[in-house]
């Protein structure tokens, strides 16, 4: 699989996961998120060459057209498969909240 | 939504369905498919900009990190979001098959 | 261009033994169904013999009116598939022609040989 | 087996006529939306050449003024106006299933 257990130990430069801290306040300027000040997004990079972990018959086929037509700008793209959610503080007020924010953390990517 | 009927119609730059025609024979060198020829099995292309049919919170998160950190590589990608199956006629010997293959065609795409 | 050249063909007596050839060019033939079909005389068109290719065990198939007579084969190193006539019979007389079915369809015919059977 | 009956078994026409020549199987030879029949033409001490494939389509360098229709047990050959060199005999074939078989065919003479 191409998660962050294999894509991380291994220099991979075909799809895979790759490490991406972001900062709320820095890189998104969103200065509600009390806590974490920021955390392990992450990000998904890198050629998809035929069969590299299609998701679906038409990543397969059009993996294989790409292959037997270089020349071509159709070819599938590294994008997140499993995601998991983040827990974050903010404040509404005085009052302070507790969210859990789905599909915030990518952990594997696959070739769509 | 990024559908063929939107993006056929429209000189759309940013991320939508693109029309690929793909012959079994000649793009794939699947001589074992007999009927159809070939077909529109399109593809996805383009830019995510911030927003754009943003497919979870991380492509949201992404889009606007890339946004404000234009240098950076990690930006989402434009993929397949609806796909249609297609029904296709071979052999098995002297015995004819149909089979219908599922998530071939690309109606619909997404920034993921 | 695809071609198929038959030969093997002519004059034999009734119980005699003939192997026709059929070479083919222009195609991947180990690909590929091959076929004999012939016309006799004044008769409409009649499969004889099928042998598929290699990716299906060489599957064959034979009509009823030539069962246990005749034998097809085919060597895909030579290109070329046979059909091993014996215990001929009057009613075999015809032109047999190779043919090459890629689908449900028989896309290709060889010129056809002729085979007679009389005393 | 599957059986195939062609009618007329034979007919006569002019040049320029409109020819139709019918295929009728004893079970379907169609499977989903694919009609596995087909038309040859057959002319003396020639060998047979493949006309339509699949019910409807041209085989490649046929003339346009060749057509086919049909679906499940009922199949049309159709000769928009007739040629000269169309005199010939035509036949059909199912690969619905094995064994692939041929219709008696229908000769197409000169009225």
């Known amino acids: 699989a191409l998660d962050t257990n294999y894509c991380f130990r291994n220099l991979e430069e075909n799809c895979c996961v790759r490490p991406l801290y972001i900062d709320f306040r820095q890189d998104l300027g969103w200065k509600w998120v009390h806590e974490p000040k920021g955390y392990y997004a992450n990000f998904c990079s890198g050629p998809c060459p035929y069969l590299r972990s299609a998701d679906t018959t038409h990543s397969t086929v059009l993996g294989l057209y790409n292959t037997l037509n270089p020349e071509a700008s159709a070819s599938p793209c590294c994008v997140p498969q499993d995601l998991e959610p983040l827990t974050i503080l903010y404040y509404v007020g005085r009052t302070p909240k507790v969210e859990q924010l789905s599909n915030m953390v990518v952990k594997s990517c696959k070739c769509s | 939504a990024l559908d063929t009927n939107y993006c056929f119609r429209n000189l759309e730059e940013n991320c939508c369905v693109r029309p690929l025609y793909i012959d079994f024979r000649q793009d794939l060198g699947w001589k074992w498919v007999h009927e159809p020829k070939g077909y529109y099995a399109n593809f996805c292309s383009g830019p995510c900009p911030y927003l754009r049919s943003a497919d979870t919170t991380h492509s949201t998160v992404l889009g606007l990190y890339n946004t404000l950190n234009p240098e950076a590589s990690a930006s989402p990608c434009c993929v397949p979001q609806d796909l249609e199956p297609l029904t296709i006629l071979y052999y098995v010997g002297r015995t004819p098959k149909v089979e219908q293959l599922s998530n071939m065609v690309v109606k619909s795409c997404k920034c993921s | 261009e695809v071609q198929l050249l038959e030969s093997g063909g002519g004059l034999v007596q009734p119980g005699g033994s003939l192997r026709l050839s059929c070479a083919a060019s222009g195609f991947d033939f180990n690909s590929y169904g091959m076929s004999w079909v012939r016309q006799a005389p004044g008769k409409g068109l009649e499969l004889v013999a099928d042998i598929v290719s290699k990716t299906y065990n060489y599957t064959t198939y034979y009509s009823d009116s030539v069962k246990d007579r005749f034998t097809i084969s085919r060597d895909d190193s030579k290109n070329t598939v046979y059909l091993q006539m014996n215990s001929l019979r009057a009613e075999d007389t015809a032109v047999y022609y190779c043919?090459?079915?890629?689908?449900?369809?028989?896309?290709?015919w060889g010129q056809g040989t002729l085979v007679t059977v009389s005393s | 087996d599957i059986q195939l009956t062609q009618s007329p078994s034979s007919l006569s026409a002019s040049v320029g006529d409109r020819v139709t020549i019918t295929c009728r199987a004893s079970q379907s030879v169609s499977i989903s939306r694919f009609n596995l029949m087909h038309w040859y033409q057959h002319k003396p001490g020639k060998q047979p050449k493949l006309l339509i494939y699949?019910?409807?389509n041209l085989a490649s360098g046929i003339p346009s003024r060749f057509s086919g229709s049909g679906s499940g047990t009922d199949f049309t050959l159709t000769i928009s106006s007739l040629q000269p060199e169309d005199f010939a005999t035509y036949y059909c074939q199912h690969s619905r299933e094995s064994p692939w078989t041929f219709g008696g065919g229908t000769k197409v003479e000169i009225k």
């Open positions: 699949r019910a409807s």
């Open positions: 043919t090459v079915a890629p689908g449900g369809s028989f896309d290709y």
